[in-house]
């Protein structure tokens, strides 16, 4: 007996071939001997089966001695043995229809779990193997679960159902809802405008929800809410914003915040949360602000940084085109009695400059100029 595997909702063609390459009488029945369809001369005739409106054949193939039964919009309950009667012989085909669905929505928040459930006909014992977009394989029986979804799990999951040495492949598109970056750092000189961007790693037609940016300034004992906003069909509207600092927010995606000026009291780290409509849980992105200030007070040239810096970052003071006068893994460095010229304060990581501030030291009789 020939075995054919089908997918729920799909179309399947069950073949039946006669030895004579011409149109002759045939009919298809199910295991209960109920006629599904057949021919009467050149006409297609249908029986009283439950497949009536979903069964078809191809007249053009009859002349080649092929008499297919085509079943559209397959259901699990279409799993049966189908019998083709042609030329006084019977061909049996066992059709097994499977369905694979994601238990929840296919749009899941980062960190959530994905459960895939296999629908199968009674008496079958299939095995399932799924491959994620990042190449991770998971195996199971009726259900497969993946916990702690990551951004790289977004995309097409390919699942293979095996039964009777035959296989059928399912493709399920999973969208992991997350920000493109889990964390970002912005380095700014004191007084500069600060741009924070929070691009999403997914696109959906309609995006509705609400969000908030909480900020923990390095100098503050507790965190505070800087801004709250709503998102409606990808349009952003601010609900509430602090007076200090007075953040501005872009009206369109990606989420975009502007801090008019970087000041030491704002240096620190923030957490932007986004709660999406009809989703439990929130999206998070951490953002950090590092602020640099270079000053000369009397005979002391000082460079300071505020905010979350890694211990391996180097802070240096150097006279332009000369070797660094001072270079330390600290958040403040200074030079006493600096010579006149353009001094550079540099914050660097393994030789790569992250932030630079220039200060002009004038001969001792005049006051310093900050460009």
């Amino acid at each position: 007996k020939k075995v054919v595997l089908g997918k729920k909702g799909d179309t399947v063609e069950l073949t039946c071939t006669a030895s004579q390459k011409k149109s002759i009488q045939f009919h298809w029945k199910n295991s209960n001997q109920i006629k599904i369809l057949g021919n009467q001369g050149s006409f297609l005739t249908k029986g009283p089966s439950k497949l009536n409106d979903r069964a078809d054949s191809r007249r053009s193939l009859w002349d080649q001695g092929n008499f297919p039964l085509i079943i559209k919009n397959l259901k699990i309950e279409d799993s049966d043995t189908y019998i083709c009667e042609v030329e006084d012989q019977k061909e049996e085909v066992q059709l097994l229809v499977f369905g694979l669905t994601a238990n929840s929505d296919t749009h899941l928040l980062q960190g959530q779990s994905l459960t895939l459930t296999l629908e199968s006909p009674p008496g079958s014992s299939p095995s399932v193997q799924c491959r994620s977009p990042r190449g991770k394989n998971i195996q199971g029986g009726k259900t497969l679960s993946v916990s702690q979804l990551e951004l790289q799990d977004s995309g097409t999951w390919t699942c293979t159902v095996l039964q009777n040495q035959k296989k059928v492949e399912f493709k399920i598109d999973i969208v992991v809802l997350a920000f493109q970056k889990a964390s970002s750092i912005v380095y700014k000189k004191e007084g500069e405008q600060v741009e924070f961007s929070f691009p999403l790693a997914f696109t959906v037609e309609k995006l509705t929800g609400s969000g908030e940016l909480w900020w923990q300034a390095e100098r503050a004992s507790s965190s505070k809410s800087w801004i709250t906003f709503d998102l409606k069909n990808k349009e952003v509207s601010v609900k509430r914003v602090t007076q200090d600092p007075k953040l501005q927010m872009g009206k369109k995606l990606p989420l975009h915040l502007t801090l008019p000026q970087a000041l030491p009291q704002y240096a620190g780290s923030g957490n932007l949360t986004l709660a999406l409509e009809a989703k439990t849980g929130k999206l998070h992105q951490e953002v950090n602000l590092v602020v640099m200030r270079a000053t000369q007070l009397q005979k002391n040239l000082t460079c300071e940084v505020w905010g979350p810096t890694s211990p391996k970052l180097m802070l240096s003071l150097k006279l332009e085109n000369k070797e660094a006068k001072v270079s330390k893994r600290e958040k403040a460095v200074w030079v006493l009695n600096p010579e006149a010229g353009m001094w550079q304060c540099l914050l660097s990581d393994s030789g790569q400059v992250l932030l630079e501030s220039n200060i002009k030291v004038l001969p001792t009789w005049s006051t310093p100029v900050q460009p």
Epitope: G6, K7, G9, D10, T11, V12, E13, G41, S42, F43, D56, R58, R59, S60, D63, I70, I71, K72
Partner: antibody, heavy 115, light 107 residues
Amino acid sequence: QVQLQQWGAGLLKPSETLSLTCAVYGGSFSGYYWSWIRQSPGKGLEWIGEINQSGSTNYNPSLKSRVTISVDTSKDQFSLKLSSVTAADTAVYYCARVINWFDSWGQGSLVTVSS
Amino acid sequence: DIQMTQSPSSVSASVGDRVTITCRASQGISSWLAWYQQKPGKAPKLLIYDASSFQSGVPSRFSGSGSGTDFTLTISSLQTDDFATYYCQQANSFPYTFGQGTKLEIK
């Protein structure tokens, strides 16, 4: 709802090979036959041939010697190659889904053969 | 090959008119016939199959009839959206063949 999207070279020189591909989105690829049809002002609508998921083909005898239709089930795509083209092959080429009737069509690709 | 001949090749009519297009097969094709509507720059669209069955979404003013060699497509009350070219197609045997088309124009 099934959608067919097609693409390929639009301008050919005589004797070259026409090559078009059609991708099927949002519907069952199995169980159907996938056809190529062309439409020219001179000959109207002309069925070129078809293929199914298993790679079984049927061709129009008038074009059979020059036509190859192939399938890539991993991508739900099928392709048409028509060799040794002449000006008479200038037409709009459509891909379509069929059991007996062409119930879904691609957007069409204008192919011009000119020296 | 089965030849499909449509008549008339063009017809002028007004909104609200009843229009009939005929299609004749060079040999019997039972009811293995479909009708398509095509608008300029667009792909044909299936209207009627099995000679008289409606494709989903097709307005009920369209109807098909016939069997064997002679078939008709009738539009009971023309709407502005119906001005297009109509084709018949046989699915009885390879190669599938189409009629040459009937252009329905506004009078």
